[in-house]
């Protein structure tokens, strides 16, 4: 399963269909980003590939989602980590893995954690290893708010469109 | 907690109340399916039992959800796995558990992974063992798209209405 | 990451901005609750702090969310557990961790599990340990229904606004 995605041409075809609306609904801001698989030691979000999209005002700037209009949003993210046999050398101590969605707002000058998931894995005891983390919740956000992520364990990410993603939609 | 659900009669009562609408909202396509607990070595989705439902155009065909109208949908699924080590042989090799939501579309003739979660468990190391996987995200889907799941580790599923489920709703 | 939240004054500032609406949307019932970090051996949900809120009819009574109007709701919850084994005695028996969202309805006089996640951890084998559980799904709910949670492993909860939460919103 890891690393399975669309071929570039198929992905392009997928993106070329016109913006699709539900007949009975006005558009609402929504975004779904995927981790860039070409960047192995960082987590860079991409919106112009595979199943990723930005709709109705959402934009991606400095690796952060910019909230287009005030309201309640459901915000979510997933990461999958993996590791191989013999990757730790002279330690049996665990590896700390964490993923957090953070809010930076004009209202207070620091990053506020909105969603946090954490795990200790023991590479020396269990190899190979794989671990998935997902979280999502509803938050009151203000126009101009910035949503970003912080990850501990980036070198261990399994970067594919279906395993590492970050998104939000207005309710 | 595993396996706890409604008695058949209570579940039936629960389903008999008329379709409920929010006064201030038009209906939108939504579905919530649960894994059939009577099928131990396969994962068959059911919509006509317990808290499961299909609404406003969603249908279930060939174990896949059929997307009733083009638009953005939030798609989600959960599985819970459990096991007990049956022999010392189990100690040496890990068990690969994975759950994936896949899209089959007229646009390209293969299954595209939308959501993937994965885990290695070491039955000989930790017995009994239990593991939960959840994921969900927003996707642009087209009328007629088919949403299905693929699971590695089906014999280890804890099949109850609250532990193994699959759903989607239009935004 | 664990335990990181807003200072009380910043949190208060955050709550004081007027209720924010999406220009193109009517308000819909929504709630996001966080676990009270001052209560170490119980899980008490709070709505009047940090990023938590109750909107458009949702209320919190007896540690349960009261559904304000009939319809389909997306219901979600997360917990993070942590621990450290202090003695070799911990090696022999696993710790059962579980988190469940339950429904209590006038339609049948018992708690129905809606969402369940479970995990066995082996403290003596792997210390320190950290584990996150998340789940969410769409359910047809009736006005007056009560949504509550049940957790096994409460003393091990990492109680912070971004790690332990419970919410719902109308679709």
């Amino acid at each position: 399963l890891p690393g399975v995605g669309l071929t570039p041409s198929a992905a392009q075809t997928a993106r070329q269909h016109p913006k699709m609306h539900l007949a009975h609904s006005t558009l609402k801001p929504a975004a779904h980003l995927i981790g860039d698989p070409s960047k192995q030691n960082s987590l860079l979000w991409r919106a112009n590939t595979d199943r990723a999209f930005l709709q109705d005002g959402f934009s991606l700037s400095n690796n952060s989602l910019l909230v287009p209009t005030s309201g309640i949003y459901f915000v979510y993210s997933q990461v999958v980590f993996s590791g191989k046999a013999y990757s730790p050398k002279a330690t049996s101590s665990p590896l700390y893995l964490a993923h957090e969605v953070q809010l930076f707002s004009s209202q207070y000058p620091f990053h506020v954690p909105l969603l946090s998931s954490q795990k200790m894995v023991y590479p020396g005891l269990q190899e190979p290893w794989l671990h998935s983390m997902y979280h999502g919740a509803a938050f009151q956000l203000t126009q101009g708010d910035q949503l970003s992520t912080h990850t501990d364990g980036i070198p261990h990410l399994v970067l594919s469109p279906s395993t590492v993603f970050f998104g939000a939609f207005a309710l | 907690l595993p396996g706890v659900g409604l008695t058949p009669s209570a579940a039936q009562t629960a389903r008999q109340h008329p379709k409920m609408h929010l006064a201030h909202s038009t209906l939108k396509p939504a579905a919530h399916l649960i894994g059939d607990p009577s099928k131990q070595n396969s994962l068959l989705w059911r919509a006509n039992t317990d808290r499961a439902f299909l609404q406003d155009g969603f249908s279930l065909s060939n174990n896949s959800l059929l997307v009733p109208t083009s638009g953005i949908y939030f798609v989600y699924s959960q599985v819970v796995f459990s096991g007990k080590a049956y022999s010392p042989k189990a100690t040496s090799s890990p068990l690969y558990l994975a759950h994936e939501v896949q899209l089959f579309s007229s646009q390209y003739p293969f299954h595209v992974p939308l959501l993937s979660s994965q885990k290695m468990v070491y039955p000989g190391l930790q017995e009994p063992w239990l593991h939960s996987m959840y994921h969900g995200a927003a996707f642009q889907l087209t009328q007629g798209d088919q949403l299905s799941t693929h699971t590695d580790g089906i014999p280890h599923l804890v099949l109850s209405p609250s532990t193994v489920f699959f759903g989607a709703f239009a935004l | 990451l664990p335990g990181v939240g807003l200072t009380p004054s910043a949190a208060q500032t955050a709550r004081q901005h007027p209720k924010m609406h999406l220009a193109h949307s009517t308000l819909k019932p929504a709630a996001h609750l966080i676990g009270d970090p001052s209560k170490q051996n119980s899980l008490l949900w709070r709505a009047n702090t940090d990023r938590a809120f109750l909107q458009d009819g949702f209320s919190l009574s007896n540690n349960s969310l009261l559904v304000p109007t009939s319809g389909i709701y997306f219901v979600y919850s997360q917990v993070v557990f942590s621990g450290k084994a202090y003695s070799p005695k911990a090696t022999s028996s696993p710790l059962y961790l579980a988190h469940e969202v339950q429904l209590f309805s006038s339609q049948y006089p018992f708690h129905v599990p809606l969402l369940s996640s479970q995990k066995m951890v082996y403290p003596g084998l792997q210390e320190p340990w950290l584990h996150s559980m998340y789940h969410g799904a769409a359910f047809q709910l009736t006005q007056g229904d009560q949504l509550s949670t049940h957790t096994d492993g409460i003393p091990h909860l990492v109680l912070s606004p971004s790690t332990v939460f419970f919410g719902a919103f109308a679709l």
């Epitope: 030691n41 101590s93 700390y96 954490q118 005891l125 501990d152 | - | 990451l1 320190p128 950290l130």
Partner: antibody, heavy 114, light 113 residues
């Protein structure tokens, strides 16, 4: 390449305190434990303890509990060892190490003397 | 605590000699589930930091010459230098990372004969 650089050593009076720093580079710091090991002049290696910078979890050698405190600043990729109530027998070269990658710093000498 | 005992404490050898250092632990360092021994060997030269040579009892670290090898399981371990070179004169330490606190052997000093 993983690199660890210690600093902060020097001459301290008995009963005094010292904070040693271990600056890491060449890898993502927060997920991997930093261990502290010391070596008295002409003696062997002694494990003081370790910290997980991301989680803040620590493991101490009982012999140092109460006198040694580990901390970390993830934004600076730096781990710290605070030693209190120092005595002459704490005179040693203090090393930080990352066992996951098998890397050690060059060490910093702490001399406790009046 | 697990006690680590190295022998000999020191030895004299010539360039080209085969050198063997042993390390005994007071309890097994073998983790039965994955059949790995939680033991490392370090080399230390005067005024320098220890350098990792071997981990998991027998895995050579990258860049370590093939003349260094580790063997053994459970409580008895050996570091072998198949043909001693001038740059190998140093002190060698074994370390267990099976349990807390991590502990080292007292060291074996390899000197020029």
């Amino acid at each position: 390449e993983v690199q660890l650089v210690e600093s902060g050593g020097g001459l301290v009076q008995p009963g005094g305190s010292l904070r040693l720093s271990c600056a890491a580079s060449g890898y993502t710091f927060s997920s991997y434990w930093i261990e502290w090991v010391r070596q008295a002049p002409g003696k062997g290696l002694e494990w003081v303890g370790e910290i997980s910078p991301g989680s803040g979890s620590t493991n101490y050698n009982e012999e140092f509990k109460g006198r040694a405190t580990f901390s970390a600043d993830n934004s600076k990729n730096t781990a710290y060892l605070q030693m209190n109530s120092l005595r002459a027998e704490d005179t040693a070269v203090y090393y930080c190490a990352d066992g996951y990658h098998g890397a050690w710093g060059q060490g910093t000498l702490v001399t406790v003397s009046s | 605590d697990i006690q680590m005992t190295q022998s000999p404490s020191s030895l004299s050898a010539s360039v080209g000699d085969r050198v063997t250092i042993t390390c005994k632990s007071s309890q097994s360092l073998l983790y039965s589930t994955n059949q790995k021994n939680f033991l490392a060997w370090y080399q230390q030269k005067p005024g320098k930091a220890p350098k990792l040579l071997i981990y998991w009892a027998s895995t050579r670290d990258s860049g370590v010459p093939s003349r260094f090898s580790g063997s053994g399981s459970g409580t008895d371990f050996t570091l072998t230098i198949s043909s001693l070179q001038p740059e190998d004169f140093a002190t060698y330490y074994c370390q267990q990372y099976y349990s807390y606190p991590r502990t080292f052997g007292q060291g074996t000093k390899v000197e020029i004969k």
